[in-house]
Amino acid sequence: NKGTDDATADSRKTYTLTDYLKNTYRLKLYSLRWISDHEYLYKQENNILVFNAEYGNSSVFLENSTFDEFGHSINDYSISPDGQFILLEYNYVKQWRHSYTASYDIYDLNKRQLITEERIPNNTQWVTWSPVGHKLAYVWNNDIYVKIEPNLPSYRITWTGKEDIIYNGITDWVYEEEVFSAYSALWWSPNGTFLAYAQFNDTEVPLIEYSFYSDESLQYPKTVRVPYPKAGAVNPTVKFFVVNTDSLSSVTNATSIQITAPASMLIGDHYLCDVTWATQERISLQWLRRIQNYSVMDICDYDESSGRWNCLVARQHIEMSTTGWVGRFRPSEPHFTLDGNSFYKIISNEEGYRHICYFQIDKKDCTFITKGTWEVIGIEALTSDYLYYISNEYKGMPGGRNLYKIQLSDYTKVTCLSCELNPERCQYYSVSFSKEAKYYQLRCSGPGLPLYTLHSSVNDKGLRVLEDNSALDKMLQNVQMPSKKLDFIILNETKFWYQMILPPHFDKSKKYPLLLDVYAGPCSQKADTVFRLNWATYLASTENIIVASFDGRGSGYQGDKIMHAINRRLGTFEVEDQIEAARQFSKMGFVDNKRIAIWGWSYGGYVTSMVLGSGSGVFKCGIAVAPVSRWEYYDSVYTERYMGLPTPEDNLDHYRNSTVMSRAENFKQVEYLLIHGTADDNVHFQQSAQISKALVDVGVDFQAMWYTDEDHGIASSTAHQHIYTHMSHFIKQCFSLP
């Protein structure tokens, strides 16, 4: 950074609220799509280019003028695996976090024309190419259809679909949000012969209802009704099927073969939580009990003589937790070897750290191939010789991410592929491998400006820089940018990490106001090495506020001792640790302890509210956006994972002890801004409405803002700008800033 250490002598502009809201300084991405083991697609000036990974030369795959006469704005595209067709998506209409409906057309790349016959219907809910060739599966009106050829009629696979009741091949609200993080509940076999799918039945699931006010001209608001199981309520049920797409015919209904859940699941409520094809005729399913400390993996083989799928009990693998729940959010996915007879999976080891274990399908026990007081974040690729994974091992920094490879013939031979590439600039990597892992793109997202590079797996040498954000770097040289500090404090002999966004020309002998930016949900991480341009950048750069985040008990990627500390006790240790962190920060000498604030969104809004309602005296003010206020209001899958059931026999007492409303009286000691979108399908407006009511009932003066028809993201352009402007005013007023 140029300029001097003296802030008064630095004439450069600061990073302003307008810079954040208008995205003045844009991080450049390099989003590629691998189409083979040596080629990828990249969009440049709306042309789709195909690049050769080895040599870096490119040619035009599809010119931007191709669809000039199309008459629709194309939202997205998808090339068939054989490169013969392109699926064009338009008329995109968002539903929930992942789900949407759209219209689709198929363009024949050989004939250079749109296919006009047997088109996919409008308002299609999901479409996916088969992994090879050009079959298509899609979901329309909650039923599944398959196209063997893009120009042939669709074969209808299911007939039971019913809006808000039966979902075939797509998830209901809670499975989308909390289990699969996707709308799709379809899984093609590797060669596209079989199509597996889940069917969800929400017949008995209670509905959340909220008003949608829409255009001013609408005299009566619309009522949105969504099947949404709250904690302890009736859950959706699930069935699982596989259909052979080679058997499809117009003159007979498709035969779907059901694979039932294991007996140990059928005794009570349960979830389907993972589907992974192992080979062309072997599939693994993971099931999870409603009390999410017990899961079972079934491995099922196709029996050609009967056309059925057999899941041998001898091949079941049980995963359980005695200290909390299974997996970080759900059981991790298996990565099968080519023959399908063994797999690698991230599970908790005896010390409570998540590592890679090697399983043989016919054996119960597994062999850990990694170990240490760090965690494997994800398995990224598996070849016959190596397994590639991302971990936070390097330099003992939980908030870092690096790519490693481990030799499968000798687990002691581990190489970090990214650690020493650019150690100052790059400490947080993600990766994208080509189809057979011959090449990979490394995406470094901090602490310096994002850097995208391409590498060869043959010798792990860097081939070329794809994007280095040099243009942005040049622009930011003229801006007084904050610095980021990542460090830890020790509490009860345990390291807890924090980050601070420090104002330009930070002087530790001065006193600064501090805003604690909190999330603090189970397995969260807010202290990391990622470079961001966000609201905190503005607050630090322009308003000279320190913005800090702290990962206390309950946070992730540091072992189960820390993560499972809040098991069955949400609203306790993770709340207390934020207060303690603020106390520790104020002891550091550069924090004005009369000007400490806290803010958070969603779970962070809950923690913010619980902190402000604790009566600690540490915080002057705070902002809660879309907070949870009582765990019985939130969805069953997420809530019960950590809290169990709200019944007297289970954990009702703590459900009732952990509400924001019960702390209403203490809000008299703080300044509080409460914000919520009225159309929040996730954390319902109900949650803030109840906080508001409780505060009013005890005579607390507070500030509030609702955002009409906004969902959990409050992301429409106008609302986004409004909320951050409003929060900025609140924080500035709280800190007595001009």
Partner: antibody, heavy 116, light 107 residues
Framework: QVKLQESGPGLVQPSQTLSITCTVS????????VHWVRQSPGKGLEWLGV???????DYDAAFISRLSISKDNSKSQVFFKMNSLQANDTAIYYC??????????WGQGTTVTVSS | EIELTQSPSSLSVSPGDRVTISCSAS??????LNWYQQKPGQAPRLLIY???NLHTGVPARFSGSGSGTDFTLTISRLQAEDFATYYC?????????FGSGTKVEIK
Amino acid sequence: QVKLQESGPGLVQPSQTLSITCTVSGFSLTTYGVHWVRQSPGKGLEWLGVIWGGGRTDYDAAFISRLSISKDNSKSQVFFKMNSLQANDTAIYYCVRNRHDWFDYWGQGTTVTVSS
Amino acid sequence: EIELTQSPSSLSVSPGDRVTISCSASQGIRNSLNWYQQKPGQAPRLLIYYSSNLHTGVPARFSGSGSGTDFTLTISRLQAEDFATYYCQQSIKLPLTFGSGTKVEIK
């Protein structure tokens, strides 16, 4: 590669039952349906019935009372039985693989003569 | 049941000629029509499925068109090996039915 082979009696007495076995290779009977089609001397093709991969059968209405199709998946065999044969049932009988909505592989056919 | 009427029932042509065979359905069958070729002493062989899609290994001189009730099989330049009987077949509804055939003979 895909093959279908019919084996039949050649000659059948009137009013007797015709039994033909179709032995297949190169594909699975649990995946693909097998149809039966016949061709009378100097005449066109006539669809008789089908057994689908899942085991379900469909027959032409004209033959439903006297036709039965079954299979043994493990032996890759499909069995065709038609009773009460008359002279006008004399034909070449083909077993045919169903591929979605078309017949992509045909057996070579077995000639059946109904005569006393 | 759906009836298929083929025309002509036979035609005499010379090698190199263009041949057009028609198939008419008694009710709309969308594009669910297939064409087969049969040579004497042999089983029928699939040429075209779903009105216009060439089956694997079938020469490009064969083409199909049509939808609804009227369909056409075209052989652009007749070769010696193309002299045979051609059948259309509908696949939209059971019972599956065939046309009565068109015999292409050498002139």
